[in-house]
């Protein structure tokens, strides 16, 4: 017998939508052979109607389609207005139609229940808005108007124009007559609720000359939309629940065992302490439409979600929701990187973050994750050079050591630093991560003296002291800029104004100036690198002023550990929030826009790893 | 609070037919799937038989050991389900437990994907 298994008969009625789920052991290669449906024909042939490779049948183009979860080993298969002529014997199976494993289902479609003759039917979701239309004739337009429900053999009434109303559609129903000449008046419910499902008969006038409508409303609770995202990357919600509810408290909240729902974020400042640093509500746009945003993805973040609209900022029945049902695949495309770095007071972090790696063109960003309200995430940096001005001289992103790994240094740390900052592009959204920074006990392990004065056309020597643990390291220094960190050129590239000379034996790496210009005014790193990846970095900062003295000046390490004056500005950021999107290129279907070159000119580091998941900073 | 209470169970000849019943009270949501899972002496739970229902769509599951001789009913709106048994033999001979949950979630055939168990309801088939 066949180890695929699924519903031998499936039932529906015309008009209506099927989602056939399929299981089979989750083996590798059934995880990733090719999944199919198809109809069997009267030949025994078996016709393909759609697959796992993409291909859909010219019956069943823009209403079916076929979804894999190899981590669940299921497929699912959804279609959509069934109509009579679907009913028939399939097969949903793996790998080749004729010899594939497959298991045998049937499905019949009907007409659906009998209505009475010119029944208008309408369907719709739970929570949403309903506007039921009932003619009349000229003779009826004094007459009472009125809706009823029919519940078994009575009628119940609902509403009428003599400002009656049921007490179980109180605040949420309206009767509207329109002007003269118009022969149509409207009842419209809003927060449907499943228990409004049923046929209702509208009634102008009264007697033998009355006119009826009868009305067949279907409720449904949403379809979940099945998403498929990979371990440690991100995921985004789009919710639109329709204008009724644009001023209403928003949430996202996930179905429990018990089917309650447990409240994520609402835009009320209630967030789920498991999504700290990795979530974000951004603001609606004026239709009520909002996007929830969750990344360093976790197998524990699969399960039901719903996105909803109350005042209470949680669900209740009868106001608008959406589902989502998320799968995480642990068969991730994203690679593992750090989720903790930890660095030192005084010290550096080196941050490694994974990009979709067919997108080496698109613009990297660095971003602060901050938790109030529904949290915003403020960019640092980007690959384009934008730095926040509390950052200039501390902070670089670096391209290297690309194929799919950018670099964020991160130095001169103090304790504000420790928090979740998120590594970001304007390509894939879902290769979105997070990464939290911690600031532990110890001392930096490069040391450089705290400002310096250089006087302008003499020669400068700043030394950077080293440990013997980087020995084996490619010590370099570089003059920081907005674009990156310049490597300066060693002694034996050539003669030049800056060069970089290292005396092994005391474990000192020198930047010598000669002679200082104005222009060598600013930042400069030293640092320690292995290949492309980069490891331990500290800053100087250099002022330039007037000869005063004649003379060389050499900056003694006895001044090593005096910190430059340090600014902090509060400039306006663009964030990762929706207000018209500052910053359009950071949600959902940006485009890619062209680099603009390698914009550091230092190669980029791996850090010591504390565990698989940590990544060391600047202390051991 | 949610009950399931089955009935319907007795004692059958060989080749016999018996109908198991069971209702549900107080199980939450519009969309729901029902099952039934029989338990031998000494044995494992194991899958029967279940239904599926999410608006005016039904979906049917059915054990390898009983397509063809059992066929599940049910209705969603009275939170009821039928198993009409029909060729009965001594291998059929458990307890039979009526399972709920409140929506189509998992793969219908193991234990751990239903929330709610009723008490069960014994079916001997003997000569």
């Known amino acids: 017998k066949s180890p695929v298994f699924g519903p031998q008969e499936v039932s529906s009625v015309e008009g209506n939508s099927v989602s056939i789920k399929c299981y089979y052991p989750p083996t590798s290669v059934n995880r990733h052979t090719r999944k199919y449906w198809c109809r069997k024909g009267a030949s025994g042939r078996c016709i393909t109607l759609v697959s796992s490779e993409g291909y859909v049948s010219s019956n069943y183009a823009g209403r079916a389609n076929l979804t894999n979860f190899p981590e669940n080993g299921t497929f699912v298969v959804n279609i959509a207005q069934l109509s009579r002529d679907d009913s028939g014997h399939y097969k949903c199976g793996l790998g080749i139609n004729s010899r594939g494993l497959s298991f045998d289902v049937s499905l019949e479609v009907s007409q659906g229940p009998e209505l009475p003759n010119g029944t208008e039917v309408y369907t719709v979701d739970v929570g949403r808005t309903v506007t039921i239309k009932c003619p009349f004739k000229t003779e009826n337009a004094p007459k009472t108007k009125a809706l009823y429900k029919k519940i078994g053999q009575t009628s119940v009434l609902v509403i009428d124009s003599r400002n009656y109303v049921n007490p179980n559609y109180k605040d949420r129903i309206r009767l509207r007559i329109p002007g003269t000449g118009q022969l149509i008046f409207t009842v419209v419910i809003d927060r449907l609720r499943l228990s409004d499902h049923g046929l209702y008969l509208c009634q102008a006038g009264d007697g033998s000359n009355r006119d009826e409508k009868n009305a067949d409303l279907q409720v449904l609770e949403p379809e979940p939309e099945l998403v498929y995202e990979d371990l440690r990357g991100s995921v985004t919600f789009h919710c639109a629940l329709g204008l009724e509810v644009a001023n209403v408290a928003k949430f996202l909240c996930r179905v429990n065992s018990r089917e309650t729902c447990d409240v994520v974020i609402n835009t009320l400042g209630k967030r789920d302490s498991a999504f700290e640093g990795r979530i974000l509500l951004n603001p609606q746009d004026k239709d009520g439409s909002f996007s929830v945003v969750i990344t360093g993805l976790r197998k524990e973040d699969e399960g039901r979600y719903l996105c909803g609209a109350h005042s209470d900022g949680q669900l209740q029945e009868g106001w608008p929701i959406q589902a989502w049902q998320l799968f995480v695949n642990e068969e991730s495309t994203i690679p593992r990187s750090p989720t903790v770095v930890k660095g030192v007071a005084g010290g550096s972090v080196a941050v490694l973050c994974p990009y979709n790696p067919k997108e080496s063109q698109s613009l990297k960003y660095w971003c602060l994750w901050e938790g109030a309200q529904n949290g915003r995430c403020p960019l640092l940096v980007e690959s384009q050079g934008l730095v926040q001005e509390q950052y200039e001289g501390r902070l670089s992103l670096l391209q290297e050591p690309g194929n799919g790994t950018f670099t964020v240094i991160l130095n001169q740390l103090t304790t504000q630093d420790a928090g979740f900052y998120w590594c970001l592009t304007n390509g894939d959204t879902r290769w979105r991560t997070t990464v939290e920074i911690k600031i532990i006990e110890g001392e930096p392990n490069l040391k450089v003296p705290g400002n310096v004065t250089a006087v302008l056309g003499e020669t400068l020597n700043i030394p950077c002291h080293f440990p013997c643990k980087f020995s084996s390291y490619e010590k370099y220094w570089c003059k920081w800029s907005n674009t990156g960190c310049q490597t300066l050129p060693s002694q034996d590239e050539g003669p030049s104004e800056a060069f970089v000379n290292c005396d092994e034996n005391s474990r000192l790496v020198s930047l010598t100036l000669n002679p200082v210009t104005r222009a060598d005014e600013g930042w400069y790193w030293c640092g320690v690198k292995q290949g492309h990846f980069y490891g331990e970095t500290a800053a100087v900062y250099v002022a330039v002023e007037e000869k005063k003295v004649a003379g060389s000046r050499y900056v003694s390490p006895a001044k090593a550990d005096a910190a430059p004056d340090e600014k902090v500005l509060d400039s306006g950021v663009r964030e990762i929030e929706n207000k018209a999107i500052q910053d359009p290129r950071l949600f959902a279907e940006e485009k890619v826009v062209a680099d603009t070159g390698d914009q550091a000119g230092g190669s980029r580091a791996s850090v010591d790893s504390s565990s698989s998941e940590e990544q060391g900073g600047s202390s051991k | 609070e949610v009950q399931l209470v089955e009935s319907g169970g007795g004692l059958v000849q060989p080749g016999g037919s018996l109908r198991l019943s069971c209702v549900a009270s107080g199980l939450p949501g519009s969309s729901s799937r029902m099952a039934w899972f029989a338990q031998a002496p000494g044995k494992e739970r194991e899958f029967v038989a279940a239904?599926?229902?999410?608006?005016?769509?039904?979906?049917?599951y059915y054990s390898d050991s009983v397509k063809g001789r059992f066929t599940v009913s049910g209705d969603n709106a009275k939170r009821t389900l039928d198993l009409q048994m029909k060729d009965l033999n001594p291998e059929d001979t458990a307890l039979y437990f009526c399972a709920a949950h409140p929506n189509d979630d998992g793969d219908p055939r193991i234990s751990g994907n239903y929330q709610y168990w009723g008490q069960g309801t014994q079916v001997t088939v003997s000569s």
């Open positions: 239904i599926a229902w999410r608006g005016r769509t039904s979906y049917k």
